[in-house]
Amino acid sequence: YPYDVPDYAGGGGSGGGGSMMTGTIETTGNISAEKGGSIILQCHLSSTTAQVTQVNWEQQDQLLAICNADLGWHISPSFKDRVAPGPGLGLTLQSLTVNDTGEYFCAYHTYPDGTYTGRIFLEVLESSVAEHGARFQIP
Protein backbone atom coordinates (compact mmCIF):
# COMPACT_ATOMS: atom_id res chain seq x y z
CA TYR A 1 0.00 0.00 0.00
CA PRO A 2 1.34 3.43 -0.87
CA TYR A 3 1.26 4.93 2.63
CA ASP A 4 4.81 5.86 3.40
CA VAL A 5 5.05 6.24 7.20
CA PRO A 6 6.98 4.07 9.67
CA ASP A 7 4.63 4.40 12.63
CA TYR A 8 0.87 4.62 12.70
CA ALA A 9 0.17 5.17 16.39
CA GLY A 10 -2.30 7.82 17.35
CA GLY A 11 -5.40 9.37 15.91
CA GLY A 12 -6.34 12.10 13.56
CA GLY A 13 -7.77 15.51 13.38
CA SER A 14 -9.10 17.99 10.89
CA GLY A 15 -12.09 20.19 11.12
CA GLY A 16 -13.98 23.39 10.66
CA GLY A 17 -13.20 26.81 11.96
CA GLY A 18 -16.09 28.52 13.60
CA SER A 19 -18.77 26.16 12.27
CA MET A 20 -21.33 24.46 14.47
CA MET A 21 -20.92 20.70 14.69
CA THR A 22 -24.46 19.70 13.78
CA GLY A 23 -23.72 16.13 12.77
CA THR A 24 -24.18 12.99 14.81
CA ILE A 25 -22.41 9.65 14.76
CA GLU A 26 -24.56 6.55 14.95
CA THR A 27 -22.79 3.31 15.89
CA THR A 28 -23.70 -0.28 16.57
CA GLY A 29 -23.15 0.48 20.27
CA ASN A 30 -22.28 -2.52 22.45
CA ILE A 31 -21.84 -5.75 20.52
CA SER A 32 -20.59 -9.26 21.14
CA ALA A 33 -19.14 -11.94 18.91
CA GLU A 34 -17.74 -15.44 19.13
CA LYS A 35 -14.08 -16.19 19.55
CA GLY A 36 -12.69 -17.20 16.15
CA GLY A 37 -15.51 -15.43 14.34
CA SER A 38 -15.72 -12.02 12.70
CA ILE A 39 -17.58 -8.78 13.37
CA ILE A 40 -18.38 -5.65 11.40
CA LEU A 41 -17.75 -2.31 13.10
CA GLN A 42 -20.00 0.36 11.64
CA CYS A 43 -20.39 4.08 12.20
CA HIS A 44 -22.63 6.43 10.25
CA LEU A 45 -22.31 10.20 10.18
CA SER A 46 -25.60 12.01 9.65
CA SER A 47 -27.23 15.44 9.96
CA THR A 48 -24.32 17.31 8.40
CA THR A 49 -23.25 18.31 4.91
CA ALA A 50 -19.59 18.37 5.96
CA GLN A 51 -17.06 16.75 3.64
CA VAL A 52 -15.51 13.61 5.11
CA THR A 53 -11.78 13.81 4.41
CA GLN A 54 -10.67 10.78 6.41
CA VAL A 55 -12.00 8.11 8.73
CA ASN A 56 -9.72 6.58 11.36
CA TRP A 57 -10.55 3.34 13.18
CA GLU A 58 -8.82 2.95 16.54
CA GLN A 59 -8.72 0.41 19.34
CA GLN A 60 -7.84 2.31 22.51
CA ASP A 61 -4.73 4.20 21.31
CA GLN A 62 -3.81 1.83 18.49
CA LEU A 63 -4.67 2.83 14.95
CA LEU A 64 -6.29 -0.07 13.09
CA ALA A 65 -7.09 1.49 9.75
CA ILE A 66 -7.52 4.69 7.78
CA CYS A 67 -9.85 5.43 4.91
CA ASN A 68 -8.62 8.58 3.18
CA ALA A 69 -10.67 10.44 0.57
CA ASP A 70 -7.73 10.64 -1.82
CA LEU A 71 -5.77 7.49 -1.04
CA GLY A 72 -8.42 4.96 -0.06
CA TRP A 73 -7.79 2.37 2.64
CA HIS A 74 -4.71 1.66 4.69
CA ILE A 75 -4.65 -1.14 7.25
CA SER A 76 -1.96 -0.86 9.93
CA PRO A 77 0.71 -3.52 9.35
CA SER A 78 0.19 -5.21 12.72
CA PHE A 79 -3.49 -5.81 11.91
CA LYS A 80 -3.23 -6.68 8.21
CA ASP A 81 -3.97 -10.37 8.71
CA ARG A 82 -7.14 -9.84 10.72
CA VAL A 83 -8.69 -6.57 9.56
CA ALA A 84 -10.50 -5.99 6.28
CA PRO A 85 -11.81 -2.69 4.94
CA GLY A 86 -15.54 -2.19 4.61
CA PRO A 87 -18.32 -2.54 4.08
CA GLY A 88 -18.40 1.15 3.17
CA LEU A 89 -16.49 3.12 5.77
CA GLY A 90 -16.89 0.30 8.27
CA LEU A 91 -14.29 -2.24 9.31
CA THR A 92 -14.38 -6.03 9.54
CA LEU A 93 -12.44 -7.76 12.31
CA GLN A 94 -11.66 -11.43 11.68
CA SER A 95 -10.30 -14.38 13.68
CA LEU A 96 -11.42 -12.75 16.88
CA THR A 97 -9.69 -13.51 20.17
CA VAL A 98 -10.68 -12.68 23.74
CA ASN A 99 -7.95 -10.01 23.66
CA ASP A 100 -10.00 -8.12 21.06
CA THR A 101 -12.54 -7.28 23.76
CA GLY A 102 -12.63 -3.56 24.41
CA GLU A 103 -13.47 -0.13 23.07
CA TYR A 104 -13.25 0.77 19.38
CA PHE A 105 -13.54 4.28 18.00
CA CYS A 106 -14.37 5.69 14.60
CA ALA A 107 -13.09 9.23 14.04
CA TYR A 108 -14.66 11.05 11.10
CA HIS A 109 -12.42 13.96 10.10
CA THR A 110 -14.57 16.45 8.23
CA TYR A 111 -14.50 19.89 6.71
CA PRO A 112 -15.70 22.27 7.90
CA ASP A 113 -17.16 20.70 11.04
CA GLY A 114 -14.16 19.07 12.68
CA THR A 115 -13.71 15.60 14.14
CA TYR A 116 -16.69 13.41 15.04
CA THR A 117 -15.96 10.36 17.18
CA GLY A 118 -18.12 7.29 17.73
CA ARG A 119 -17.59 4.52 20.30
CA ILE A 120 -18.29 0.79 20.03
CA PHE A 121 -17.72 -1.73 22.81
CA LEU A 122 -16.96 -5.25 21.61
CA GLU A 123 -16.97 -8.30 23.85
CA VAL A 124 -15.50 -11.46 22.39
CA LEU A 125 -17.08 -14.50 24.03
CA GLU A 126 -16.09 -18.13 24.20
CA SER A 127 -18.22 -19.78 21.52
CA SER A 128 -20.27 -21.83 24.00
CA VAL A 129 -21.24 -18.67 25.89
CA ALA A 130 -22.10 -16.84 22.70
CA GLU A 131 -24.28 -19.71 21.53
CA HIS A 132 -26.41 -19.37 24.67
CA GLY A 133 -27.41 -15.88 23.66
CA ALA A 134 -25.39 -13.71 26.00
CA ARG A 135 -25.68 -10.39 24.20
CA PHE A 136 -25.29 -6.73 25.01
CA GLN A 137 -28.32 -4.59 24.34
CA ILE A 138 -27.71 -2.07 21.59
CA PRO A 139 -28.84 1.32 22.92
Partner: antibody, heavy 119, light 107 residues
Framework: EVQLVESGGGLVQPGGSLRLSCAAS????????MHWVRQAPGKGLEWVAF????????YYADTVKGRFTISRDNAKNSLYLQMNSLRAEDTAVYYC????????????WGQGTMVTVSS | DIQMTQSPSSLSASVGDRVTITCRAS??????LAWYQQKPGKAPKLLIY???TLQSGVPSRFSGSGSGTDFTLTISSLQPEDFATYYC?????????FGGGTKVEIK
Protein backbone atom coordinates in the same frame (compact mmCIF):
# COMPACT_ATOMS: atom_id res chain seq x y z
CA GLU B 1 15.82 11.22 4.19
CA VAL B 2 12.78 13.49 3.98
CA GLN B 3 13.69 16.91 2.59
CA LEU B 4 11.57 19.98 1.89
CA VAL B 5 13.21 23.00 0.28
CA GLU B 6 11.32 26.26 -0.17
CA SER B 7 12.22 28.94 -2.69
CA GLY B 8 10.71 32.03 -4.31
CA GLY B 9 10.75 34.44 -1.37
CA GLY B 10 11.97 37.98 -1.62
CA LEU B 11 11.06 41.64 -1.39
CA VAL B 12 7.81 42.73 -3.02
CA GLN B 13 5.75 45.92 -2.91
CA PRO B 14 2.27 46.02 -1.34
CA GLY B 15 -0.28 44.80 -3.86
CA GLY B 16 2.33 42.72 -5.63
CA SER B 17 2.54 38.98 -6.25
CA LEU B 18 4.95 36.20 -5.47
CA ARG B 19 4.99 32.46 -6.08
CA LEU B 20 6.62 30.20 -3.54
CA SER B 21 7.76 26.68 -4.35
CA CYS B 22 8.58 23.71 -2.16
CA ALA B 23 10.63 20.86 -3.62
CA ALA B 24 10.09 17.54 -1.85
CA SER B 25 12.36 14.50 -1.82
CA UNK B 26 13.00 11.36 0.21
CA UNK B 27 9.37 10.22 0.38
CA UNK B 28 6.42 9.45 -1.86
CA UNK B 29 5.16 13.01 -2.24
CA UNK B 30 1.88 12.05 -3.90
CA UNK B 31 0.76 10.21 -0.73
CA UNK B 32 0.91 13.18 1.62
CA UNK B 33 -1.16 16.23 2.36
CA MET B 34 0.93 19.40 2.58
CA HIS B 35 0.69 22.67 4.50
CA TRP B 36 2.04 26.18 4.28
CA VAL B 37 2.71 27.80 7.67
CA ARG B 38 4.19 31.26 8.23
CA GLN B 39 5.98 33.09 11.00
CA ALA B 40 6.21 36.87 11.14
CA PRO B 41 9.52 38.22 12.49
CA GLY B 42 9.69 37.66 16.24
CA LYS B 43 6.17 36.19 16.31
CA GLY B 44 4.53 32.79 16.58
CA LEU B 45 3.39 30.28 13.98
CA GLU B 46 0.32 30.81 11.79
CA TRP B 47 -1.21 28.13 9.57
CA VAL B 48 -1.84 29.43 6.03
CA ALA B 49 -3.14 26.68 3.76
CA PHE B 50 -3.52 22.95 3.25
CA UNK B 51 -3.81 20.71 0.21
CA UNK B 52 -4.58 17.01 0.35
CA UNK B 53 -2.50 14.38 -1.44
CA UNK B 54 -4.69 14.31 -4.55
CA UNK B 55 -5.73 17.98 -4.36
CA UNK B 56 -9.35 17.07 -3.62
CA UNK B 57 -9.32 19.08 -0.37
CA UNK B 58 -7.93 22.62 -0.23
CA TYR B 59 -8.36 24.89 2.79
CA TYR B 60 -7.15 28.40 3.66
CA ALA B 61 -6.84 30.61 6.69
CA ASP B 62 -9.34 33.49 6.58
CA THR B 63 -6.47 35.99 6.51
CA VAL B 64 -5.32 34.76 3.07
CA LYS B 65 -8.54 33.43 1.53
CA GLY B 66 -9.15 34.91 -1.92
CA ARG B 67 -5.56 36.17 -2.20
CA PHE B 68 -3.43 33.03 -1.90
CA THR B 69 -3.71 29.82 -3.91
CA ILE B 70 -2.12 26.53 -2.87
CA SER B 71 -1.42 23.90 -5.53
CA ARG B 72 0.80 20.92 -6.16
CA ASP B 73 2.34 18.96 -9.01
CA ASN B 74 2.79 15.37 -7.89
CA ALA B 75 4.73 14.49 -11.05
CA LYS B 76 7.32 17.13 -10.10
CA ASN B 77 7.23 16.48 -6.33
CA SER B 78 6.44 20.14 -5.85
CA LEU B 79 4.13 22.29 -3.75
CA TYR B 80 3.29 25.91 -4.59
CA LEU B 81 1.80 28.99 -2.98
CA GLN B 82 0.69 31.78 -5.32
CA MET B 83 0.41 34.97 -3.28
CA ASN B 84 -1.46 37.93 -4.78
CA SER B 85 -2.51 41.34 -3.39
CA LEU B 86 0.26 41.12 -0.83
CA ARG B 87 0.09 43.25 2.31
CA ALA B 88 2.67 44.36 4.85
CA GLU B 89 1.18 41.91 7.35
CA ASP B 90 2.06 39.03 5.01
CA THR B 91 5.75 39.63 5.78
CA ALA B 92 7.00 36.38 7.29
CA VAL B 93 9.09 33.28 6.87
CA TYR B 94 6.97 30.78 4.94
CA TYR B 95 7.44 27.09 5.68
CA CYS B 96 6.11 24.13 3.76
CA UNK B 97 5.33 21.17 5.97
CA UNK B 98 4.29 17.58 5.39
CA UNK B 99 1.19 16.24 7.08
CA UNK B 100 1.33 12.99 8.96
CA UNK B 101 -0.72 10.35 7.20
CA UNK B 102 -2.71 9.33 10.22
CA UNK B 103 -3.73 12.82 11.26
CA UNK B 104 -3.30 16.46 10.42
CA UNK B 105 -0.15 17.61 12.19
CA UNK B 106 3.11 18.52 10.50
CA UNK B 107 5.89 15.96 10.86
CA UNK B 108 8.54 17.44 8.53
CA TRP B 109 9.21 21.09 7.74
CA GLY B 110 11.36 22.93 5.23
CA GLN B 111 13.90 25.54 6.27
CA GLY B 112 11.61 28.39 5.21
CA THR B 113 11.77 31.24 2.73
CA MET B 114 11.48 34.92 3.72
CA VAL B 115 8.81 37.11 2.14
CA THR B 116 9.06 40.86 2.78
CA VAL B 117 6.23 43.13 1.70
CA SER B 118 7.34 46.75 1.83
CA SER B 119 7.37 49.87 -0.28
CA ASP C 1 -11.49 29.84 15.62
CA ILE C 2 -10.10 27.88 18.56
CA GLN C 3 -7.74 29.97 20.68
CA MET C 4 -4.72 28.21 22.14
CA THR C 5 -3.22 29.77 25.27
CA GLN C 6 0.21 28.68 26.45
CA SER C 7 1.74 29.34 29.84
CA PRO C 8 4.17 30.48 30.86
CA SER C 9 5.31 32.60 27.91
CA SER C 10 8.89 32.11 29.09
CA LEU C 11 10.75 30.31 31.83
CA SER C 12 14.30 29.93 33.07
CA ALA C 13 15.57 26.51 34.04
CA SER C 14 18.78 24.59 34.60
CA VAL C 15 20.08 21.42 32.99
CA GLY C 16 18.51 18.46 34.77
CA ASP C 17 15.37 20.35 35.81
CA ARG C 18 11.88 19.01 35.23
CA VAL C 19 9.99 21.48 33.04
CA THR C 20 6.24 21.67 32.51
CA ILE C 21 4.46 23.79 29.89
CA THR C 22 0.69 24.03 29.71
CA CYS C 23 -1.64 24.70 26.81
CA ARG C 24 -5.34 25.50 27.09
CA ALA C 25 -7.85 25.40 24.23
CA SER C 26 -10.84 27.75 24.13
CA UNK C 27 -13.07 24.73 23.56
CA UNK C 28 -12.67 20.97 23.68
CA UNK C 29 -10.29 19.51 21.10
CA UNK C 30 -10.53 15.94 22.39
CA UNK C 31 -6.98 14.51 22.25
CA UNK C 32 -5.99 16.36 19.10
CA LEU C 33 -3.00 18.44 20.19
CA ALA C 34 0.58 18.55 18.92
CA TRP C 35 3.74 20.02 20.46
CA TYR C 36 6.63 21.48 18.44
CA GLN C 37 10.11 22.63 19.33
CA GLN C 38 11.72 25.53 17.47
CA LYS C 39 15.26 26.81 17.80
CA PRO C 40 16.31 30.28 16.56
CA GLY C 41 16.58 30.46 12.78
CA LYS C 42 15.35 26.88 12.38
CA ALA C 43 12.11 25.20 11.36
CA PRO C 44 9.80 23.74 14.01
CA LYS C 45 10.18 20.07 14.88
CA LEU C 46 7.25 17.81 15.80
CA LEU C 47 7.65 16.32 19.29
CA ILE C 48 4.22 15.01 20.32
CA TYR C 49 0.98 14.46 18.43
CA UNK C 50 -2.48 13.29 19.37
CA UNK C 51 -1.91 14.68 22.85
CA UNK C 52 0.54 12.07 24.11
CA THR C 53 2.09 10.12 21.23
CA LEU C 54 5.84 10.65 20.87
CA GLN C 55 6.98 11.34 17.32
CA SER C 56 9.52 8.82 16.05
CA GLY C 57 13.09 9.81 16.97
CA VAL C 58 12.12 12.19 19.78
CA PRO C 59 13.82 11.46 23.15
CA SER C 60 11.65 9.84 25.79
CA ARG C 61 12.29 12.67 28.26
CA PHE C 62 9.53 14.51 26.37
CA SER C 63 5.99 13.53 27.22
CA GLY C 64 2.54 14.94 26.64
CA SER C 65 -0.70 14.54 28.52
CA GLY C 66 -4.21 15.91 28.68
CA SER C 67 -7.45 15.91 26.74
CA GLY C 68 -10.40 18.21 26.22
CA THR C 69 -9.12 21.71 26.88
CA ASP C 70 -6.06 21.28 29.11
CA PHE C 71 -2.75 19.81 27.97
CA THR C 72 0.78 19.56 29.34
CA LEU C 73 4.22 19.08 27.82
CA THR C 74 6.79 17.77 30.28
CA ILE C 75 10.54 17.54 29.87
CA SER C 76 11.61 15.17 32.63
CA SER C 77 15.27 16.20 32.73
CA LEU C 78 16.20 19.27 30.72
CA GLN C 79 19.22 18.86 28.44
CA PRO C 80 21.37 21.62 26.89
CA GLU C 81 19.82 21.00 23.46
CA ASP C 82 16.30 21.52 24.86
CA PHE C 83 16.64 25.28 25.26
CA ALA C 84 14.22 26.49 22.60
CA THR C 85 10.69 27.77 22.05
CA TYR C 86 7.82 25.30 22.31
CA TYR C 87 4.48 25.64 20.55
CA CYS C 88 1.25 23.73 20.96
CA UNK C 89 -1.13 23.28 18.01
CA UNK C 90 -4.65 21.95 17.85
CA UNK C 91 -5.39 19.59 14.97
CA UNK C 92 -9.05 19.04 15.69
CA UNK C 93 -10.55 21.88 13.67
CA UNK C 94 -9.89 24.23 10.82
CA UNK C 95 -8.17 26.57 10.94
CA UNK C 96 -5.33 24.79 12.68
CA UNK C 97 -4.18 27.15 15.41
CA PHE C 98 -1.01 27.44 17.46
CA GLY C 99 -0.32 28.68 20.95
CA GLY C 100 1.79 31.79 21.39
CA GLY C 101 4.87 29.80 22.37
CA THR C 102 6.92 29.19 25.52
CA LYS C 103 10.58 30.17 25.49
CA VAL C 104 12.75 27.93 27.68
CA GLU C 105 15.93 29.78 28.63
CA ILE C 106 19.03 28.89 30.60
CA LYS C 107 18.96 30.03 34.23
Amino acid sequence: EVQLVESGGGLVQPGGSLRLSCAASGFTFSNFGMHWVRQAPGKGLEWVAFISSGSSSIYYADTVKGRFTISRDNAKNSLYLQMNSLRAEDTAVYYCARMRLDYYAMDYWGQGTMVTVSS
Amino acid sequence: DIQMTQSPSSLSASVGDRVTITCRASKSISKYLAWYQQKPGKAPKLLIYSGSTLQSGVPSRFSGSGSGTDFTLTISSLQPEDFATYYCQQHNEYPWTFGGGTKVEIK
